[in-house]
Interface confidence: low
């Protein structure tokens, strides 16, 4: 056979990934691999992840002769050991006026009155602790509640009898109930005055309010 058909172990080099070929015999060779590779032709990237020091739930990502930690959002650093200050990163981490407090591995919100939840986004149901009179409807508000009274009832908690029920205001006057004491308030039409809007007005003074 001609010389061009002779097998030369290192020509071309069978070593990959930057490995250096060394002829060890007429038909044998040895690859000296770069750090991070192994195998007879340096074909395998060594899995460095078993050598990990990823802390706090970090996930190891293999590289060439090294590894990195993919950290959960609340941790940072090469090995996920450094606490992320969520309060700096997310100025709006706490809603509705809540105050952000950084903690190791997370953060907490100190909510203002009327709000709750991890990020203070939940309006506290004040109706759960309200004392609206049975038969009335409670409406939740921020840090408060209001009672919607059925016909015939009045007051903040609907615990008073509605004085307007007996139509005490005359001459087409508007009747309103004082929510504090249940008494009626007449708003008189033009030309009338008095607690019940029964008195004529000399001059054209309009819309007199009278409480009773």
């Amino acid at each position: 056979a001609g010389s061009d058909s002779l097998y030369v172990p290192c020509a071309p080099s069978p070593c990959v990934n930057g490995g250096t070929c060394r002829q060890t015999g007429d038909f044998t060779f040895e690859c000296n691999c770069l750090p991070g590779f192994e195998g007879s032709t340096c074909e395998r990237n060594i899995d460095d992840c078993p050598n990990h020091r990823c802390q706090n739930g970090g996930v190891c990502v293999d590289g060439v002769n090294t590894y990195n930690c993919r950290c959960p959002p609340q941790w940072t650093g090469q090995f996920c050991t450094e606490d992320v200050d969520e309060c700096l990163l997310q100025p709006n981490a706490c809603q509705n006026g809540g105050t952000c407090a950084n903690r190791n591995g997370g953060y907490g919100c100190v909510c203002v009155n009327g709000w709750s939840g991890d990020d203070c986004s939940e309006n506290i149901d004040d109706c759960a602790f309200a004392s609206c009179t049975p038969g009335s409807t409670c409406i939740d508000r921020v840090a408060s509640f209001s009672c919607m009274c059925p016909e015939g009832k009045a007051g903040l908690l609907c615990h008073l009898d509605d004085a307007c029920i007996s139509n005490p205001c005359h001459k087409g006057a508007l009747c309103d109930t004082n929510p504090l004491n249940g008494q009626y308030i007449c708003t008189c039409p033009q030309g009338y005055k008095g607690a019940d809007c029964t008195e004529d007005v000399d001059e054209g003074n309009s819309h007199h309010h009278h409480h009773h």
């Epitope: 460095d48 078993p50 050598n51 996930v59 090469q78």
Partner: antibody
Amino acid sequence: EVQLVQSGAEVKKPGESLKISCKGSGYTFSNYVIHWVRQMPGKGPEWTGYIIPGSGGTKFNEKFKGQATISVDKSITTAYLQWSSLKASDTAMYYCARDGAGSFTYWGQGTLVTVSS
Amino acid sequence: DIVMTQSPDSLAVSLGERATINCRSSQSLVHSDGNTYLHWYQQKPGQPPKLLIYRISNRFSGVPDRFSGSGSGTDFTLTISSLQAEDVAVYYCLQSTHFPDTFGGGTKVEIK
């Protein structure tokens, strides 16, 4: 071949300072954590702390925090464990170990530190 | 810290017989990455500990196949299937799932 070679045995008096060394070879020194493990006479090993040679970052067992410092000289692939003021209770065998498989794979031969007045 | 409890403290076994060492952790050693970082070491007098088994059941290079590891969660076992004279040593388990890494108290294996 991965090797960790530690400095020789030391006999010191309480209050003295000491720096022991651990030289790594046969691997890329910067890519692996170096640990220090203490073993008191007749007791089991205790993990003391580690150093990340690439960044110089250290992490300690709370039990040993403030008692010793760990440092590294990448140029000579050597890690150190150092005390500024030794106590009798520091008497122990100290091993350096290289990270591997999530454990301590390769160990130095150990440095015996004896603190006695 | 995670407490690693080994049993028994010492064990005397006839040559060629099976030796079993147990290690229990105070909480699960399953890491969030799915691995369980529980390892076994052998230490002979005047020598550093030597890694035998890593991550429950993987024999480290050069370790004879008479050494095997098993277990999951919080309970783990090192088995020497046929004790040899050179196996006389103290055996330690180590967890490195949780910070800080903690060793068991050790089990001394002797020949009966």
